[in-house]
């Protein structure tokens, strides 16, 4: 059945900037997306943005930029002008309408830094890019090797030089492996029926937006599709919530908000599946 996920993210560069990401997992073409804060649209919430696949977008302060990320997900950038950050305690809701089948809505907020389920507050987490990690790792090994060689040459001039194998350990892989099990425990805590695949898959390169969100195919024409098998929910970033239709939130665990360019993690090795067969395209 259709599901809506919501993820609220504090920008790493500016603590006063927030981004709300929302996505729809379900059959049918999306006719309208409404983002509100303070509660659901039509139930006490205040509209921040409305995104229509054909007619464009409308937004209201403090929304800064609303845009489609894929044909089934959107992002909304918010500018927090106040000295104290009211967004930190605010609920953001996204409503996806698939006319006339129905409307589905879910809400989420930025998790407080005091949340015991989270290992760190929502501040920038230094994550090395794979290529930089490799270069730095190799440089470190070479430097260490040179120093070690000099040390050996000083002590024993006739001893043969040791052969060094540069390490290509991917720091992102280590991060993801360390993160995945906590995701499962988080999900179990919030939703005893959740089935989370914690197996680690290699990072999928060159399939992401610069902000680390999966790039899915978009097409020009509307092409309503029939229902298809449920796609696996992507592993989401910090503070994300997946709405499940048994009325529970499943917290999708934690991941550093920026994994660097070109890195997308999925709960299985197949990446984003069944997208074209599940959504009417924009």
């Amino acid at each position: 059945t259709p599901e809506v996920w919501v993820q609220v993210q504090m920008e790493a560069t500016e603590l006063s900037s927030f981004t709300v990401h929302c996505g729809f997992l379900g059959p049918g073409s999306i006719s309208l997306v409404t983002v509100s804060w303070g509660g659901p649209d039509g139930a006490g919430g205040t509209k921040l943005a409305v995104l229509h696949p054909e007619l464009g977008t409308r937004q209201w302060a403090p929304a800064r930029q609303a845009r489609w990320e894929t044909q089934s997900s959107i992002s909304l950038a918010l500018e927090d002008s106040g000295a104290s950050s009211p967004f930190a305690n605010t609920t953001f809701c996204c409503k996806f309408a698939s006319f006339p089948e129905g409307s589905w809505e879910s809400c989420g907020s930025l998790p407080p830094s005091s949340d015991p389920g989270l290992s760190a507050p929502p501040t920038p987490v230094p994550i090395l890019r794979a290529d930089l990690a490799g270069i730095l790792g190799l440089s470190g090994v070479l430097l260490f090797g040179c120093g070690y060689l000099l040390h050996l040459l000083r002590r024993q001039k006739h001893r043969p030089t040791p052969r060094l194998q540069p390490s290509h350990t991917n720091s992102q892989a280590l991060t993801a492996q360390a993160w995945a099990p906590s995701q499962a425990s988080q999900a179990a805590l919030h939703d005893p029926y959740a089935t989370i695949n914690t197996s680690f898959c290699p990072a999928t390169l060159d399939t992401a937006h610069p902000n680390g969100w999966a790039s899915l195919p978009t097409h020009a024409a509307h092409q309503p599709q029939g229902p298809a098998a449920s796609a696996s929910t992507p592993i989401l970033a910090r503070g994300s919530f997946v709405s499940v239709e048994n009325g529970l939130y499943t917290q999708a665990g934690e991941r550093p908000p920026h994994t660097g360019p070109g890195l997308t993690l999925f709960p299985d090795c197949r990446g984003p599946r069944a997208v074209e067969g599940r959504f009417g395209v924009r």
Epitope: T1, V4, L55
Partner: antibody
């Protein structure tokens, strides 16, 4: 308090048209779609169509083959359902309902009008 | 269109008993909604998206199913539960309702 108030009972002759109104109050009119369902005496429910009150988009049950028209007036928060070329089998109670939004962790509620009996008789 | 067939057409039970109402779809649907209707009243949403209780619906009601077969269960009947129940699919246009199951007091 959310309310949908429908117009009164109608008696029509075959071939005529009927226009039933549904006035909404107690909520932001354009936030929810309105759909129409009819129920012939002693029979089950039949979906006639849905109107998106925000942009006037409509979706109709093809069974009515162009006989049904749904419109809305945002200034009065009213939705109208017009059925033309009436026949005796169109005798039924016509309900308008506010479509529900499936919102996780918030109450999911539907609201219905009281129904309008339309009798088609010569 | 997708035809929904409800069974039984009439179910005669006593208060306190368990009621099981079935809805079979002519082809696979994504989820099912259930409505309750009492004489002279408008229908009322009971269960949405197969298994979720609408606001104010007692916990004795539950829904389940997938594909073509869906079930509404009332664990222990109360006097106010005797009514007509309809299933509805919204997976395919036109949206269709089942013909209804009348739950009557035995």
């Amino acid at each position: 308090e959310v309310q949908l108030v429908q117009s009164g009972a109608e008696v029509k002759k075959p071939g005529a048209s009927v226009k039933v109104s549904c006035k909404a109050s107690g909520y932001t009119f354009t936030d929810y779609w309105i759909y129409w369902v009819r129920q012939a005496p002693g029979q089950g429910l039949e979906w006639m169509g849905t109107i998106d009150t925000s942009d006037h988009k409509t979706s109709y049950n093809q069974k009515f083959r162009g006989r049904v028209t749904m419109t809305r007036d945002t200034s009065t928060s009213t939705v109208y359902m017009e059925l033309s070329s009436l026949r005796s089998e169109d005798t039924a109670v016509y309900y308008c309902a506010r479509d529900f939004i499936i919102t996780v962790n918030y109450p999911v509620v539907d609201y219905w009008g009281q129904g309008t009996l339309v009798t088609v008789s010569s | 269109q997708i035809v929904l067939t409800q069974s039984p057409a009439t179910l005669s039970l006593s208060p306190g008993e368990r009621a099981t109402l079935s809805c079979s779809a002519g082809s696979s649907v994504n989820y099912m909604h259930w409505f309750q209707q009492k004489p002279g009243q408008a229908p009322r949403l009971l269960i949405y998206s197969t298994s979720n209780l609408a606001s104010g619906v007692p916990a004795r009601f539950s829904g389940s199913g997938s594909g073509t077969d869906y079930t509404l269960t009332i664990s222990s009947l109360e006097p106010e539960d005797f009514a007509v129940y309809y299933c509805q699919q919204r997976s395919s246009l036109p949206f269709t309702f089942g013909q209804g199951t009348k739950l009557e007091i035995k």
